[in-house]
């Protein structure tokens, strides 16, 4: 990351929150990120979210942490250990694997901080690398070489 | 959200400079959001990262803004219409539909932090929603009612 | 050589459940996907859906609302089970087999005669 | 649905000549990575089930006689009887197995002129 000049917070503002106060997003409502209401099981729907019409289905599970940013994450988890066939969306294909995309995201967490002499001082927000499963892909299986 | 306590930075302390230097992550590195070096073609490699292995393969493209936290993000494209053939790797089996999966990442912006009578006082972090693209999935085409 | 024979209720009341049932002699009811297709009379060939490895159906979206496809293996039978029935559910109803190639259903091989089936109250 | 016509409805072919049905689907039925197209045709004769007689669009079944052909590729097939039998006379069907739901033709109604 790039160097940003210093950010200090005026007087009686306080950074976490206004992060958490943060709520008007003008972003359409997307399908993923939010379980699915389909009927969980290894077949590819012709209707419905994109998780569910995939021929490598997954569901979400929500993982919430509220000492974190965002407290609310979905991780993926695929219904099929194959990918199920584009001629019925029903049996499945084993010339293909269904495998987890996952990623790194950043999120912040709540941390005590600490002035002079170790005495606490309200809390700061640390930034990490959180692993999370984004979605099921269809894949071509290895070649061992 | 729920609502956290109060965050106070210590004197000295300045909250973005601490996210920004957090840099120690725990973390394995991972295939994605990172560009494959992979040929870029309509085919499901055998080998290489989950993106060029895919029958429904994309590329990543690079979005940085040295204003938003996390800087880099990386966008899906798809580099298919519809999904390649398990059977071949190289030809198209128009039965599939090669889509992007999009999701809602939260992102923070730095922006100028405004004291009393409207002075400038350093910078502060707004959260927002950002829409990316993180993958493309091999779906059924939906069926029109 | 393997025979197909279906079997059921020839009369079946208005909104009650058609059941019907295909009995496989022959041959193994395994590794194969099989079919049920209905012919109203005087008319043309419906497919109703079909069931692959005992277990992964595909109905007509006209009918799947309706329909049940399943598979016995100890008795080596496949069962159709159509629920609300009217007059328009008519017709000789076939069961068959169809080839499998390569992870994919091909096409219907082997027929049996049909039973037919009338709606009437 | 991929909807399955046929043409002509019926046809009248005299003993020993040739007999040409026609079959279009509304998209392709082909896939190009194992070159084969999803398309069958069955022979319906009177108070009997279909027969098989043609797969993969141009593949004979077991038994079938030579007569017998199928031909096209993508959305467009035929069906010909080389030299028509008096026990060719039957309705035939063509349907498509690419994608689920499966669709037949309406069929074409073959007699002796």
């Known amino acids: 990351y790039s160097h940003w000049p210093s950010c200090c917070p005026s007087k009686g503002q306080d950074t976490s929150e206004e992060l958490l106060r943060w709520s008007t997003v003008p972003v359409p409502p997307l399908e993923p990120a939010r379980p699915n209401r389909h009927p969980e099981s290894c077949r590819a729907s012709e209707d419905g979210p994109l998780n569910s019409r995939a021929i490598s289905p997954w569901r979400y599970e929500l993982d919430r942490d509220l000492n974190r940013l965002p407290q609310d994450l979905y991780h993926a988890r695929c219904l099929c250990p194959h990918c199920v066939s584009l001629q019925t969306g029903s049996h499945m294909d084993p010339r293909g694997n269904s495998e987890l995309l996952y990623h790194n995201q950043t999120v912040f967490y709540r941390r005590p901080c600490h002035g002079e002499k170790g005495t606490h001082k309200g809390y700061c927000l640390e930034r990490r690398l959180y692993r999370v499963s984004l979605a099921c892909v269809c894949v071509r299986p290895r070649v061992m070489g | 959200y729920s609502h956290w306590p109060s965050c106070c930075p210590s004197k000295g302390q300045d909250t973005s400079e601490e996210l920004l230097r957090w840099s120690t992550v725990p973390v394995p590195p991972l295939e994605p959001a990172r560009p494959n070096r992979h040929p870029e073609s309509c085919r499901a490699s055998e080998d290489g990262p989950l993106n060029s292995r895919a029958i429904s393969p994309w590329r990543y493209e690079l979005d940085r803004d040295l204003n938003r936290l996390p800087q880099d993000l990386y966008h899906a494209r798809c580099l298919c219409p519809h999904c390649v053939s398990l059977q071949t790797g190289s030809h198209m089996d128009p039965r599939g539909n090669s889509e992007l999966l999009y999701h809602n990442q939260t992102v923070f912006y730095r922006r100028p932090c405004h004291g009393e009578k409207g002075t400038h006082k350093g910078y502060c972090l707004e959260r927002r929603l950002y829409r990316v693209s993180l993958a493309c999935v091999c779906v059924r085409p939906r069926v029109m009612g | 050589q393997v025979q197909l024979q279906e079997s059921g209720p020839g009369l079946v009341k208005p909104s009650e459940t058609l059941s019907l049932t295909c009995t496989v002699s022959g041959g193994s009811i395994n590794s194969y996907s099989w079919t049920w297709i209905r012919q109203p009379p005087g008319k043309g060939l419906e497919w109703i859906g079909n069931?692959?490895?005992?277990?992964?159906?595909n109905y007509n979206p006209s009918l799947k609302s309706r329909v049940t496809i399943s598979v016995d293996t100890s008795k080596s039978q496949v069962s159709l089970k159509l629920n609300s029935v009217t007059a328009a559910d008519t017709a000789v109803y076939y069961c068959?087999?169809?080839?499998?190639?390569?992870?994919?259903?091909?096409?219907?091989?082997?027929w049996g005669q049909g039973t037919t089936v009338t709606v009437s109250s | 649905d991929i909807v399955m016509t046929q043409f002509p409805d019926s046809l009248a072919v005299s003993l020993g000549e040739r007999a040409t049905i026609n079959c279009k689907s509304s998209?392709?039925?082909?896939?190009?990575?194992?070159?084969?197209?999803?398309l069958a045709w069955y022979q319906q004769k009177p108070g009997q089930p279909p027969k098989l007689l043609i797969y993969w669009a141009s593949t004979r079944e077991f038994g079938v006689p030579a007569r017998f052909s199928g031909s096209g590729s993508g959305t467009d097939f035929t069906l010909t009887i080389s030299s028509l039998q008096a026990e060719d006379v039957a309705v035939y069907y063509c349907q498509q197995y690419y994608s689920t739901p499966f669709t037949f033709g309406p069929g074409t109604k073959v007699d002796i002129k």
């Open positions: 068959a087999r169809t080839y499998n190639w390569n992870y994919e259903i091909g096409a219907m091989g082997v």
């Open positions: 069931i692959y490895n005992s277990e992964n159906t």
């Open positions: 998209q392709n039925v082909l896939i190009t990575s194992n070159n084969k197209n999803y």
